[in-house]
């Protein structure tokens, strides 16, 4: 446990609990130690959010949370003299922060972002139903790698949806993807309620399509070799190989978890290259192959976004219909 004796009486409440927002969605609470705390008390602070979530016991007089400010969030803080979780803390003091004002029906909805090939982020949204159709939107974004909040420049419209893309390139820094991108959409005139989103960089990643390098037949198998999209290592990807046979009109899809180029037939030591052997393919017929990839759960939280299909490549001969 913590240092010092643990007096039986409850500690006084913390003082000067205040809340502020940094960046777009980093909410920071700070407080001062209680006045008149027992002199032999080594102060620890117990805090939790309004719904009794995220309980924390720590000696710091500060707590932060990355949270989309679309609804009110409250922190309750109390002090105690030990790290003993069963010790009753002081009276809890609460401080809340509310989202920016505005008609909730005016806020944009369906604010979502996809990180394309770990190189640029594309966000889209639907206007709120109580919004003037000529609303001029602006999207702001922030990531730990940026010194300041940035504004997304090129807003476009596709159907009823609006969108904007901005460069976000994965850097070699190992902690880069442990941080999220904070997003806010509002309008220039300040008439609509701003909308916020936090995009973890380990989710909503859509790789570029792979590039088929080589197709060859060996002992009744079709050997497929392809180059993975830049920025991804092969063990972080899951693959789908589709083979269409023009004669039998069969359409086979193979799910591939590991695609190592171990066979001697494959070109070896080619960086970022993956391979797969499709069994039982007739070499005297035309076979058309295409491949797509998605991130896997080994490296990413999300495994739902497939890349587009690669360009097709064919091998074999189309039989004359006699």
């Amino acid at each position: 446990g913590g240092g010092g004796a643990a007096p039986t009486e409850t500690q006084p409440p913390v003082t000067n609990l205040s809340v502020s927002v940094e960046n777009l969605c980093t909410v920071i609470w700070t407080w001062n130690p209680p006045e008149g705390a027992s002199p032999n008390c080594s102060l620890w602070y117990f805090s939790h959010f309004g719904d009794k979530q995220d309980k924390k016991l720590a000696p710091e007089t500060r707590r932060s949370k990355e949270v989309p400010l679309n609804e009110k969030i409250c922190l309750q803080v109390g002090s105690q003299c030990s790290t003993n979780e069963s010790e009753k803390p002081s009276i809890l003091v609460e401080k809340c922060i509310s989202p920016p004002e505005g008609d909730p029906e005016s806020a944009v909805t369906e604010l979502q972002c996809i990180w394309h090939n770990l190189s640029y982020m594309q966000c889209s949204w639907l206007p709120g139903r109580n919004t003037s159709p000529d609303t001029n939107y602006t999207l702001y974004y922030w990531h730990r790698s940026l010194e300041k909040i940035r504004q997304c420049e090129e807003i476009y419209k596709e159907g009823q949806y609006f969108g904007c893309s901005f460069d976000l390139t994965k850097v070699k820094d190992s902690s880069f993807e442990q941080h999220s991108v904070q997003i806010m959409v509002k309008d220039y005139a300040g008439k609509i309620k701003p909308s916020f989103n936090i995009v973890p960089l380990t989710s909503r990643v859509k790789p570029d399509p792979p590039h088929i390098k080589n197709l060859s037949f060996h002992n009744g198998d079709l050997h497929v070799q392809w180059e993975n999209p830049q920025n991804f290592i092969s063990r972080c990807l899951f693959y789908e190989v589709e083979v269409n046979n023009s004669q039998t009109e069969t359409h086979n899809v193979f799910s591939v978890q590991e695609a190592k180029c171990q066979n001697p037939e494959f070109e070896r030591n080619v960086e970022n290259t993956s391979c797969f052997m499709v069994p039982g393919v007739l070499p005297d017929t035309l076979n058309t192959v295409r491949i797509r990839v998605k991130t896997n759960k080994l490296c990413y939280e999300d495994d739902k976004l497939w890349s587009n299909w690669s360009q097709e490549m064919s091998i074999g001969k189309k039989r004359n219909s006699t």
């Epitope: 206007p127 139903r129 949806y161």
Partner: antibody, heavy 118, light 107 residues
């Protein structure tokens, strides 16, 4: 050319249920909200419900909230209106309509008649 | 909800006439108004959106004007196929609401 086809109307008893379907073509279906609008001789045209292109957002008139649900299958270019706890006042011709770039209706289905009567 | 009131509720006119139908909103709706034409036993058809923008494929004899609370639909020279019921609809705020209709009949 944009086409909208609605179906599924019929005669149903008060308290009963009915599911209307709407299939559309000729535009990028997933990018547009689809709505249902009904018409009666007494009340004229009345917007009933809508669903955003992704299906993530749904909207309802107060008169049907809690009784009607709307869904869509973008792989089939189809929208569904599930009508439960039907009342006599729900009797109307129901039109499926594609929204334009905002909440006006630039293409309409031919309409399907729903009669709620015992 | 915003109330939309059309006038007149019915109107008799002859082929070649210039006809004006008006629509009033219970509160300002900027220019976010649409007009529809409906023939008996048929679905409504979009004519105009954003108060004055003609839907593609709609003849240029149809025009719309107005902003705020007062709007008009004008048919510059009536054709036989124009005899129908016309509706206005606001989309400035949710839910979208329609006028009660103006029936245009042959004199």
């Amino acid at each position: 050319e944009v086409q909208v086809l609605d179906s599924g109307g019929g005669l149903v008893q008060p308290g009963g249920s009915l599911r209307l379907s709407c299939t559309a073509s000729g535009f990028t279906f997933r990018l547009y909200t689809m709505s249902w609008v009904r018409q009666t001789p007494g009340r004229g045209l009345e917007w009933v419900s809508g669903i955003s292109g992704s299906g993530l957002s749904t909207y309802f008139a107060d008169s049907v909230k809690g009784r009607f649900t709307i869904s869509r299958d973008n792989s089939k270019n189809t929208v569904y209106l599930q009508m439960n706890s039907l009342r006599a006042e729900d009797t109307a011709v129901y039109y499926c309509a594609k929204e334009g770039d905002w909440i006006y209706f630039d293409s309409w289905g031919q309409g399907t008649l729903v009669i709620v009567s015992s | 909800d915003i109330q939309m009131t059309q006038s007149p509720s019915s109107l008799s006119a002859s082929v070649g006439d210039r006809v004006t139908i008006t629509c009033r909103a219970s509160q300002g709706i900027s220019s976010w108004l649409a007009w529809y034409q409906q023939k008996p036993e048929k679905a409504p058809k979009s004519l105009i959106y954003a108060a004055s923008s003609l839907q593609s494929g709609v003849p240029s004899r149809f025009s719309g004007s107005g902003s705020g609370t007062d709007f008009t639909l004008t048919i510059s020279s009536l054709q036989p196929e124009d005899f129908a019921t016309y509706y206005c609809q606001q989309y400035n705020s949710h839910p979208p609401t329609f006028g009660q209709g103006t029936k245009l009949e042959i004199k």
